[in-house]
Structures are given as structure tokens and as C-alpha cells.
Interface confidence: low
């Protein structure tokens, strides 16, 4: 699986979105894990509704919420009031039985408020090397930005 | 970090950031600043991968270009057009879970 790349801004909602082909997993719930350390295990998150059939209803853990498009094929996680801590190697998954497939594996990168000195100290460097093949980036700002528009809050 | 020094207002300086020990392609870098008695501040970001996504803080906005060589594991600050209040220590960081590492910095100095 390639790692597509999710940016936010500290503060604000980040929408990730994994695209899937919803005949094949037809019937499955999905989970949002986050992935401790390359070869770790992935970290149940939030899950879709117990019963498929109301997959549609948001579930929220904490500030993760996650609903499921299962007729166009699209998960879809929130992260409110993103935080620099959020950043990390997340995944979508199908779930069948007691095994998991990975629809996407997601890096959620994190931009830090330039405004909100308070975390000036909690941007990292990471403590093991990462590889990513062909990681591409998508663009999940929470609010709409015009071509070269600068999502730095207005200073005062 | 390296390239800071002393320079008169108006002149310019290169900063330089070598990373290691990560997939430097993959993650969003940025430039801060401190100055003595004051909050370390945001100055510049770009974006992973090619590096088209690009941020400047108001203050160097115009005068500051921040760019990368994904190949070489570099991230640079252009600074052009400098002024008195640029005058600060300066950091390249990346945002990724790990532990904190903020290096020495570069000092810069814009003094006639």
C-alpha cells in the first residue's frame, strides 16, 4: 500500500477520506488505527456503527468521528481540533471476522499555528526512520484556500 | 542549521538545514525564530514531496523564501531584504511524533 499524505493546520478539523470498492467489501464495518512504529501494531481508534446497515451514522472517540459512505465507497474520518500529537501513520480498515484489511494507510501531518506559541515545543522529530513508497500528498486543509492563499491566521 | 552571520540592513543570508534519520521527503519542514526575551515564532513552512506548498509568516512575507532538495535532505531560508527585528537564533523543524529536538540554530544578526 502506498501512504497518502493528509495535511492540517493545529486547531482546526482535518477530513481524511479512504476510497474503497464498495461491492467487494459489502457487509464490512471499517476502523480508523493508528500504527505504533513501522512494523507495530495498529491501534483501534473508532469504529462504524455495530450494524452495517446504519455505517452512516458518525461515531465519535474522543475527537475522532468516523462515518461510511458503503453505497459510493468512501470512509471518512474527522480529527477535530487537530493537535501537533495527532500527527503519525494512521490506517482505514475492512473488518471481517477477526482479520482487518487495509484500505489506505494515511500519514497525517500536522502545520503548526503559527499564532498558538503554547505548542511551539511539541513539534517532533521522529525517533525511528520511516519509509514511505511513493507517499503523495493531499492537501485536507479544514477550510477552502484559493490557489497561493496562506491558511496563517490574520495577525492582529 | 548554518548560514546565519552578521549582515547590514538590506543585505541578505542562505540558511541551511541537513536532516537525517527519517524519510525527509515525507514530512512538512519549517523555519522558526527566536529572539532574545521573546516567543519563539513561525516563520516559514513547505509542504512534503515537491514542495509547492508554501507558508510565510506576515513579517517576512515577500522577503523570505523558504525551498527543499528532497534529494540531498536539505531545507534552506533565503532571506532577503533583512531588517533589524529579523535579528534572532534560527531553527529548521519537522512535525512528527518522536522526541523533541529543536539542534543549535543559526544566529542572525542585522546591525549597521
Known amino acids: 500500500h502506498n501512504t497518502t499524505v493528509f495535511q492540517g493546520v493545529a486547531g482546526q478539523s482535518l477530513q481524511v477520506s479512504c476510497p474503497y470498492d464498495s461491492m467487494k467489501h459489502w457487509g464490512r464495518r471499517k476502523a480508523w488505527c493508528r500504527q505504533l512504529g513501522e512494523k507495530g501494531p495498529c491501534q483501534r481508534v473508532v469504529s462504524t456503527h455495530n450494524l452495517w446497515l446504519l455505517s452512516f451514522l458518525r461515531r465519535w472517540n474522543g475527537s475522532t468521528a468516523i462515518t461510511d459512505d458503503t453505497l459510493g465507497g468512501t470512509l471518512t474520518i474527522t480529527l477535530r481540533n487537530l493537535q501537533p500529537h495527532d500527527a503519525g501513520l494512521y490506517q482505514c480498515q475492512s473488518l471481517h471476522g477477526s482479520e482487518a484489511d487495509t484500505l489506505r494507510k494515511v500519514l497525517v501531518e500536522v502545520l503548526a499555528d503559527p499564532l498558538d506559541h503554547r505548542d511551539a515545543g511539541d513539534l517532533w522529530f521522529p525517533g525511528e526512520s520511516e519509509s514511505f513508497e511513493d507517499a503523495h500528498v493531499e492537501h485536507s486543509i479544514s477550510r477552502s484556500l484559493l490557489e497561493g492563499e496562506i491558511p496563517f491566521p490574520p495577525t492582529s | 542549521e548554518s548560514g546565519g552571520g552578521l549582515v547590514q540592513p538590506g543585505g541578505s543570508l542562505r540558511l541551511s538545514c541537513a536532516a537525517s534519520g527519517f524519510a525527509f521527503g515525507n514530512y512538512v519542514m519549517h523555519w522558526y525564530r527566536q529572539a532574545p526575551e521573546k516567543e519563539r515564532e513561525l516563520v516559514a513552512i513547505?509542504?512534503?514531496?515537491?514542495?509547492?506548498?508554501?507558508n510565510y509568516a506576515d513579517s517576512v512575507k515577500g522577503r523570505f523564501t523558504i525551498s527543499r532538495d528532497n534529494a540531498k535532505n536539505m531545507v534552506y531560508l533565503q532571506m532577503n531584504n533583512l531588517k533589524p527585528e529579523d535579528t534572532a537564533v534560527y531553527y529548521c523543524?519537522?512535525?512528527?511524533?518522536?522526541?523533541?529536538?529543536w539542534g543549535q540554530g543559526t544566529q542572525v544578526t542585522v546591525s549597521s
Open positions: 523543524n519537522v512535525v512528527y511524533i518522536g522526541r523533541p529536538n
Open positions: 513547505i509542504g512534503s514531496q515537491g514542495g509547492t506548498y508554501t
